[in-house]
């Protein structure tokens, strides 16, 4: 499955939108930094079949979409930017879903790569727990925004490697 060129442009647009979403000076949030334990090894792309990598990417985008679709997220970010960001993620999910079906067939996808998908889910659980503990403060969201930018960059790099394998 070849992800369309518009997919990588969508990645870039999503990162730009996320960068634009900042509302407070990040410098005031230094003490709120937190180790979310991003599962970097799941995104190095070496040990995966293409289908497995796509399923992990899909989970990453899905969880990001879920995180930024909550009521708490709506209260934290400028609405039009948030909507544009969600739209970009939604389009990426559609592209990746089409690819997953093409690569492995519908029957196999739920069983694929469960450990990696679980690692991504636990990572997002840690992010949600952090936000809850910090009472969804502006700085907590700022730290999470920085973290998601970093993790989406890893996702983008994995997608680039997948395209080079084609």
């Amino acid at each position: 499955c070849d992800l369309p060129q518009t997919h990588s442009l969508g990645n870039r647009r999503a990162l730009i939108l996320l960068a634009q979403m900042g509302r407070i000076s990040h410098f005031s949030c230094l003490k709120d930094r937190h180790d979310f334990g991003f599962p970097e090894e799941e995104f190095d792309g070496h040990q995966f079949q293409k289908a497995q990598a796509i399923s992990v990417l899909h989970e990453m985008i899905q969880q990001t979409f879920n995180l930024f679709s909550t009521e708490d997220s709506s209260a934290a970010w400028e609405q039009s930017l948030l909507e544009k960001f969600s739209t970009e993620l939604y389009q990426q999910l559609n592209d990746l879903e089409a690819c997953v079906i093409q690569e492995v067939g519908v029957e196999e996808t739920p069983l694929m790569n469960e450990d990696s998908i679980l690692a991504v889910r636990k990572y997002f659980q840690r992010i949600t727990l952090y936000l809850t503990e910090k009472k969804y403060s502006p700085c907590a969201w700022e730290v999470v925004r920085a973290e998601i930018m970093r993790s989406l960059s890893f996702s983008t790099n994995l997608q680039k490697r997948l395209r080079r394998k084609d």
Epitope: A19, G22, S25, H26, F27, C29, L30, K31, D32, R33, H34, D35, F36, E142, V143, A146, E147, M149, R150, S153
Partner: antibody, heavy 121, light 107 residues
Amino acid sequence: EVQLVQSGAEVKKPGESLKISCKGSGYSFTSYWIGWVRQMPGKGLEWMGIIDPSDSDTAYSPSFQGQVTISADKSISTAYLQWSSLKASDTAMYYCARHPGLNWAPDFDYWGQGTLVTVSS
Amino acid sequence: DIQMTQSPSSLSASVGDRVTITCRASQSIDGALNWYQQKPGKAPKLLIYFASSLQSGVPSRFSGSGSGTDFTLTISSLQPEDFATYYCQQAYDFPLTFGQGTKVEIK
């Protein structure tokens, strides 16, 4: 390979202006902040300030606020430190270093080679 | 501002010695402390970040510990290339601040 390359040594007279540079390569320049650190001859390290090149937001140490200006041009992956009127006491080695911002990652993991600024009449 | 106080300011040691440098913050900084090594005429080099994480490529004889206000850098067996000045730096809040440095010299 990540690199921060600083501009060359400068010899200036008191009252003159100066702008030194720090060019980043081998990484996404806007994903990291750039900090500036002063080291006067035979002395320790002093943090001066920092910039987020993605939006040019800055923070300064109170000791350096109003004395220097930090800026960045993300189109050429370069951060700057400038003085409008140098003093003899500005004579020092100046280092730039990258900072991961709000991410949980090593602070100041890569440094420039330093720019020696000498101010003398 | 958070003040960082290192001790000792200098020490003499021999190759193979275990060396300990301490750093104290004027208020709690959780675990947001970094250690750097600097040799004459060179830029500082990050050794330890977030109090105890060893920076990639740094020998395992270097270790860091502590949290709150009291921190320690330990060199388990001093090597000839370890003679340098060491700085702690709080990474908890702006303005970032460094300790005054500890010079490790050959006995």
